[in-house]
Amino acid sequence: SSPTSSASSFSSSAPFLASAVSAQPPLPDQCPALCECSEAARTVKCVNRNLTEVPTDLPAYVRNLFLTGNQLAVLPAGAFARRPPLAELAALNLSGSRLDEVRAGAFEHLPSLRQLDLSHNPLADLSPFAFSGSNASVSAPSPLVELILNHIVPPEDERQNRSFEGMVVAALLAGRALQGLRRLELASNHFLYLPRDVLAQLPSLRHLDLSNNSLVSLTYVSFRNLTHLESLHLEDNALKVLHNGTLAELQGLPHIRVFLDNNPWVCDCHMADMVTWLKETEVVQGKDRLTCAYPEKMRNRVLLELNSADLDCDPILPPSLQTS
């Protein structure tokens, strides 16, 4: 078998047939078949190889593991548990690998895992204990710092009879294991709402990406506890207006940058407070790009250029005067 590659390049290994549980012990830093390994970069790439399982014989040195573009379908409990454990594994990318089921304890025995990317997998069945590993009310803290869950919503016909938002949030909150999470990306998931308790229980967040969802309102969402939050991406949602409570909370976050582009802002009398706030605040990035979508007469008007006289509401007619 060929040795692992030097610092400068990746090399495909020869087929490796001895597993950690087979008759002869594996050579400690052998590269699995169908993978490319760089010991110098502490990186293993098993990319676009139609793998149906996680390779059993990953080299102990692996710090960065790419298993993208495969056909894994299911991650069982202990999918990465090895003897000896993969103690150095810090970054794991499983994006685009046709995962639809991630079981409780799938990432157990990875003591250094800081970055996990499950994006572009149709996760119809994400266990509440996928990240916490146990069903205890308070689990051992997860080492995860970055969790990338962009476009994990399954096709509508494959969704279970439960809230997809609820399933994801349950996994984020189980056992309070993700208290140290700093980056959470949940873009492109068709989220209609954000459960009100989720942000309060992720106090270390620096970066939250909720872009390209279907969020209509942030009325019941509290950002107050997210004192470390540096970026909040809300582009490409269905937001109509931000109300006073939300505006005040965002203004109170010391390091925040908010991204609000491409929302269908409704420029009526309810928008007055937000327009006033936009004119004063420095937290909104590209605020000069925000435009009205409704009502028709206000379409494409720049929010920053509006004044109170522009923002009227049609009077609500008493029932006796309404027409059908």
């Epitope: 001895a18 078949a33 149906t52 399982e53 059993t56 014989d57 299911v74 279970q160």
Partner: antibody, heavy 120, light 111 residues
Framework: EVQLVESGGGVVQPGRSLRLSCAAS????????MHWVRQAPGKGLEWVAY????????YYADTVKGRFTISRDNSKNTLYLQMNSLRAEDTAVYYC?????????????WGQGTTVTVSS | DIVMTQTPLSLSVTPGQPASISCRAS??????????LHWYLQKPGQPPQLLIY???NLESGVPDRFSGSGSGTDFTLKISRVEAEDVGVYYC?????????FGQGTKLEIK
């Protein structure tokens, strides 16, 4: 037509070794995971070992772990089972079987089996 | 390990009559995405053959008098009208985790 043909069975003394082969034809061998399953005389079926299509994953039953090694040569369309330190309880008909994946898969094609007898 | 328990261990059925075999797993072998339970028939002197995969899906070429149902821990294989060629030993098997395990088998005889 999918065909799996096992060979290499025989009578062997305890502690000795044997290598089984399974020749595959009628399908793209390199696209499928493969199993060995055994059946002791008059008994039921027991899963023995699995190897993924590209030899990246290997799994064994506890009863054979450390003694048996599963391997494959996709260029020869052949699956192997190296059996060392054989015991009387390894006596069985050994079947090779095809699957599309380990957990989401099932044994959708079987060979006729080869008989291994471990006896002094 | 997951233990698969089949009942009955043997049954004798008159041709044309229905038959039913039960399989119980010691823990759930279903997720909301997939059911990890499969059925096989081993005819006398032959290797096993796949009948039903994922609890209820009929394998290609298997007569439609065979059907499977169940989820979680309890599963059933039914033969709507037994024929002489159906004799043999029926096995259920899970693929939830390693090790894969089979039921102990149910022997079907013709009266």
């Amino acid at each position: 037509e999918v065909q799996l043909v096992e060979s290499g069975g025989g009578v062997v003394q305890p502690g000795r070794s044997l290598r089984l082969s399974c020749a595959a034809s009628g399908f793209t061998f390199s696209n499928f995971g493969m199993h060995w399953v055994r059946q002791a005389p008059g008994k039921g079926l027991e899963w023995v070992a699995y190897i993924s299509s590209g030899s990246t994953s290997f799994y064994y039953a506890d009863t054979v772990k450390g003694r048996f090694t599963i391997s494959r040569d996709n260029s020869k369309n052949t699956l192997y089972l190296q059996m060392n330190s054989l015991r009387a309880e390894d006596t069985a008909v050994y079947y090779c079987s095809r699957t599309n994946s380990l957990l989401r898969g099932f044994f959708d094609a079987w060979g006729q089996g080869t008989t291994v007898t471990v006896s002094s | 390990d997951i233990v698969m328990t089949q009942t009955p261990l043997s049954l004798s059925v008159t041709p044309g009559q229905p038959a039913s075999i039960s399989c119980r797993a010691s823990q759930s072998v279903s997720s909301s995405s997939y059911t990890y339970l499969h059925w096989y028939l081993q005819k006398p002197g032959q290797p096993p053959q796949l009948l039903i995969y994922s609890a209820s899906n009929l394998e290609s070429g298997v007569p439609d008098r065979f059907s499977g149902s169940g989820s979680g821990t309890d599963f059933t294989l039914k033969i709507s009208r037994v024929e002489a060629e159906d004799v043999g030993v029926y096995y259920c098997q899970h693929s939830w985790e390693i090790p894969l395990t089979f039921g102990q088998g149910t022997k079907l005889e013709i009266k």
